[in-house]
């Protein structure tokens, strides 16, 4: 189903963006990129 495919790819994209920020903070010490409280 196309909605399912879209949701999966968006979820994967969202995870990759979150992981990129995480890696920048914890392995790159780039604290300005730290995720703030919602």
């Amino acid at each position: 189903h196309s909605d399912g495919i879209f949701t999966d790819s968006y979820s994967r994209y969202r995870k990759q963006m979150a992981v990129k920020k995480y890696l920048a903070a914890v392995l790159g010490k780039r604290y300005k990129q730290r995720v703030k409280n919602k």
Partner: antibody, heavy 112, light 107 residues
């Protein structure tokens, strides 16, 4: 003193569940990434996943589905819920603030 | 996947020691860190972003490399340095991948 203390480890039967806690003292964890890492006896380090300040958690592919990371900012504590445990999950489980401040670890033994 | 070599290294106090960490694909953002771990203890963060020394870590430790090949060097091994060392690299689909570890033991 700034420290992280894990608790909740112990002996559990295969197929069982366990919730580990990671409590902080001397530091406010709320704006930090919190990470869980494990180490099987005599083996290397294995990354489980992390939770961001907003409460969104992300996992290694092998951990997704069985392991859940959550946080309670009011208690300055992070949790690792582990379900459907197997013998190969036997390990010392560490929590870390970012990856530069670590707890002492808590041993989980999965055995009948 | 990160492969460390050697898996065990025998050395003497004062020796220059080099540990290699090789990745099967390029490490994202050069986000490669090194940790030291002693038996029964938690890992200690030494180096981040391949070559930057964590605050409080002695200057005899240094890191270098980029892309798929990285090294940790201890310029003059001290008694306190006998331990196991792990590299950890950024992977945008898996998060953090750890190397298998290198045990530095007394010759």
């Amino acid at each position: 003193e700034v420290q992280l203390v894990e608790s909740g480890g112990g002996l559990v039967q295969p197929g069982g569940s366990l919730r580990l806690s990671c409590a902080a003292s001397g530091i406010d964890l709320n704006s930090y990434y919190m990470t869980w890492v494990r180490q099987a006896p005599g083996k290397g380090l294995e990354w489980i996943g992390f939770i961001d300040a907003g409460g969104d958690a992300y996992y290694a592919s092998w951990a997704k589905g069985r392991f859940t990371i959550s946080r309670d900012n009011s208690k300055n504590t992070v949790y690792l819920q582990m379900n459907s445990l197997r013998a190969e999950d036997t390990a010392v489980y560490f929590c870390a603030r970012d990856l530069d401040l670590w707890g002492q670890g808590t041993l989980v033994t999965v055995s009948s | 996947q990160l492969t460390q070599s050697p898996s065990t290294l025998s050395a003497s106090v004062g020796d220059r020691v080099t540990i290699t960490c090789q990745s099967s694909e390029s490490v994202y953002g050069n986000y490669l860190a090194w940790f030291q771990q002693k038996p029964g203890k938690a890992p200690k963060f030494l180096i981040y972003e391949a070559s930057k020394l964590e605050s409080g870590v002695p200057s005899r430790f240094s890191g270098s490399g980029s892309g798929t090949e990285f090294t940790l060097t201890i310029s003059s091994l001290q008694p306190d340095d006998f331990a196991t060392y792990y590299c950890a690299g950024g992977d945008i689909s898996e998060g953090v991948a750890f190397g298998g570890g290198t045990k530095v033991e007394i010759k």
